[in-house]
């Protein structure tokens, strides 16, 4: 049997027999455009496509609309996979979204959404989420219903302010809302009372900036 040489996501990579964590090249069906993504082949059954990771503050997340569209950073470290790829991928079949969080006290938590997709660029990559479970809060820290994506040069939030400029980073801001996983990275002991940090309100409350975050997706099967 001929080995499949192009994969749309890490679930396909996993099913092809590649079961080691690492960076893989993904290609959407009917496309020649490639992206490099980190695949988590160990967490919860394997085959997770990492679409965002924060871990050490090495990458600047205060980026433009275009940069968030195409992706930036290092897939082995801190990075954003890219709104366009994720939008196209999540509109081809049903995906789940898992958000894994770490605080500075050694605790970990997660939020799992049973259905996740992004609208097209014409609709500002609006986020759509359904069915929250997990340990990082009973209420969704991503405002529901979902908001349009905003960046420092594309103000699509519901605020009279510019949330992305005020809080830094591109995110699905409301006015401005209970989360921002793309905010400023603050080191330990400087991570409290921060208005523009890495925020997941319904786990750690206001002003607490997290140590690490990972957003990962996988087909719902």
């Amino acid at each position: 049997k001929e080995e499949q040489i192009s994969f749309r996501d890490c679930a396909e990579v996993f099913k092809s027999g590649h079961t080691t964590n690492g960076v893989y090249t993904l290609t959407l069906p009917n496309s020649t455009e490639e992206v490099k993504a980190y695949c988590d082949m160990e967490a919860g059954g394997g085959g997770w496509t990492i679409i965002q990771r924060r871990e050490d503050g090495s990458v600047d997340f205060q980026r433009t609309w275009k940069e968030y569209k195409v992706g930036f950073g290092n897939p082995s470290g801190e990075y954003w996979l890219g709104n366009e790829f994720v939008s196209q991928l999540t509109n081809q079949q049903r995906y789940v979204l898992k958000i894994h969080l770490k605080d500075w006290e050694g605790n970990e938590a997660y939020s799992l959404y049973e259905h996740f997709y992004l609208s097209s660029e014409e609709l500002n990559y609006r986020i759509h989420l359904k069915g929250l479970t997990g340990t990082a809060g009973k209420i969704s820290s991503i405002s529901q219903p979902g908001n349009d994506f905003s960046t420092k040069d594309a103000d699509n939030d519901k605020c009279i302010c510019k949330c992305s400029q005020m809080l830094t980073g591109g995110w699905w801001f409301d006015a401005c809302g209970p989360s921002n996983l793309n905010g400023m990275y603050y080191p330990q002991r400087q991570n409290t009372n921060k208005f523009n940090g890495i925020k997941w309100y319904y786990w750690k409350g206001s002003g607490y900036s997290l140590k690490g975050t990972t957003m990962m997706i996988r087909p719902a099967d």
């Epitope: 820290s141 519901k158 605020c159 009279i160 302010c161 949330c163 005020m166 006015a175 401005c176 809302g177 209970p178 009372n193 921060k194 208005f195 309100y201 319904y202 206001s206 002003g207």
Partner: nanobody, 134 residues
Framework: EVQLVESGGGSVQAGGSLRLSCAAS????????IGWFRQAPGKEREGVSC????????NYADSVKGRFTISSDTAKNTVYLQMNSLKPEDTAVYYC???????????????????????????WGQGTQVTVSS
């Protein structure tokens, strides 16, 4: 560094009054809305009232409307919560908190309102205890 210091809490009989004060420092007072939240034992924290001194926007929880009044003194960088006709169910720790006044929707501005959603507030004081006995 942002600091919010509450005072004025204490014990009072039902029907009595208290005035809480929140002294703010470390930021431009006029650029922020100040909120009061409370948390009773075993209950979720809830919004009580807020004020934006720059435009006088206020908001009150339904449970305190007509009984509590919020006001600010910009010269002293202080916000006051006058609590009248107190009830046993007002017993809680009361927290003062701050959020940039611009962090509002156009609809809120039109309605002259500030946030009572606690996730919008970045800075919190240590709290002051209010006990109302019957």
């Amino acid at each position: 560094e942002v600091q919010l210091v509450e005072s004025g809490g204490g014990s009072v009989q039902a029907g009595g009054s208290l005035r809480l004060s929140c002294a703010a420092s470390g930021f431009t007072f006029d650029d922020y809305a100040i909120g009061w939240f409370r948390q009773a034992p075993g209950k979720e924290r809830e919004g009580v009232s807020c004020i934006s001194s720059s435009d006088g926007s206020t908001n009150y929880a339904d449970s305190v409307k007509g009984r509590f009044t919020i006001s600010s003194d910009t010269a002293k960088n202080t916000v006051y919560l006058q609590m009248n006709s107190l009830k046993p169910e007002d017993t809680a720790v009361y927290y003062c908190t701050a959020v940039p006044a611009t962090r509002r929707t156009p609809q809120m501005v039109d309605a002259n309102m500030c946030w009572l959603a606690e996730y919008e507030y970045d800075y919190w004081g240590q709290g002051t205890q209010v006990t109302v006995s019957s």
